[in-house]
């Protein structure tokens, strides 16, 4: 089982992000996006093997309108 | 069981429109991006347009960009493909896929396509 | 648009054989790659996505590294079921573009 993805690389831009408290920004299309209903993976257990790119979190997890805090601890973060 | 039930495929004309649907189901659709993306025959998977949770961003990729509409309807847990203009080269399966993102901090961070349909053959031809 | 190139096109071999598929892309795309696994008549199947990370259900035989521009993805002990092709896809800009595939065959 592998860690969740590591993070930040070269496109991220730095925190806080441009976007209001009830956007996000989208790293794949680069601009802000509303997220109040977003669902997005749960961690994986920071298991054996080798670190894999960013923190993720499991399918299923409701992510609310105020999502601009990391719930957990992002591990690589600049 | 989460899934993605496709249906709409067929025959037409060049020039002529085709839409497709694409049914959710086992998961709370109006919260994931959806894609639609195609396989020629023999050919590479090709990309072809994705859809915002909420339907308020939409983008294309460029063989398809002022032919095709890609919609949703989250009441229905539908997602739809108007395909118009129809060419030759638009002969393909087509899948929907589901968007499958992580939420860092108020970052979205995007991790490909985690849910796919079982796919529908669109054949264009005179 | 971001080109991924994937070799081999295709390859022969045995049950048992470890695998390494390799894509490569046109610019930097941090770890921002998935692969994909097709069978015929089938839909494509996340197996690994942000480079190296494995989707959940897969079997932990595959594995994916790389970051920038080379990426790689191994098989460590091949067996029946993976008989297929694979795909590499950048999830780092629109458009979203695939590798053309590698198809693994029985030797």
């Known amino acids: 089982m592998r860690r969740g993805p590591r993070s930040l690389r070269g496109r991220d831009a730095p925190a806080p992000t441009p976007c209001v408290p009830a956007e996000c920004f989208d790293l794949l299309v680069r601009h802000c996006v509303a997220c109040g209903l977003l669902r997005t993976p749960r961690p994986k257990p920071a298991g054996a093997s080798s670190p894999a790119p960013r923190t993720a979190l499991q399918p299923q997890e409701s992510v609310g309108a105020g999502a601009g805090e990391a719930a957990l601890p992002l591990p690589g973060l600049l | 069981e989460v899934q993605l039930v496709q249906s709409g495929g067929g025959v037409v004309q060049p020039g002529r429109s085709l839409r497709l649907s694409c049914a959710a189901s086992?998961?709370?659709?109006?919260?994931?991006?959806m894609h639609w993306v195609r396989q020629a025959p023999g050919k590479c998977l090709e990309w072809v347009a994705v859809i915002w949770y909420d339907g308020s961003n939409k983008y294309y990729g460029d063989s398809v960009k002022g032919r095709f509409t890609i919609s949703r309807d989250n009441s229905k847990n539908t997602l739809y493909l108007q395909m118009n203009s129809l060419r030759d080269e638009d002969t393909a399966v087509y899948y929907c896929?589901?968007?499958?993102?992580?939420?860092?901090?108020?970052?979205?961070?995007?991790?490909?396509?985690?849910?796919w349909g079982q796919g529908t053959t669109v054949t264009v031809s005179s | 648009e971001i080109v991924l190139t994937q070799s081999p096109s295709s390859l022969s071999a045995s049950v048992g054989d470890r695998v390494t598929i390799t894509c490569r892309a046109s610019q930097s795309i941090s770890s921002y790659l998935n692969w994909y696994q097709q069978k015929p008549g089938k839909a494509p199947k996340l197996l690994i996505y942000a480079a190296s990370s494995l989707q959940s259900g897969v079997p932990s035989r595959f594995s994916g590294s790389g970051s920038g521009t080379d990426f790689t993805l191994t098989i460590s002990s091949l067996q029946p079921e993976d008989f297929a092709t694979y795909y590499c896809?950048?999830?780092?800009?629109?458009?979203?573009?695939f590798g053309c595939g590698t198809k693994v065959e029985i030797k």
């Open positions: 086992g998961f709370t659709f109006g919260s994931y991006g």
């Open positions: 896809q950048q999830s780092y800009s629109t458009p979203l573009t």
């Open positions: 896929a589901r968007r499958f993102t992580h939420l860092r901090g108020q970052y979205i961070e995007d991790y490909g396509m985690d849910v």
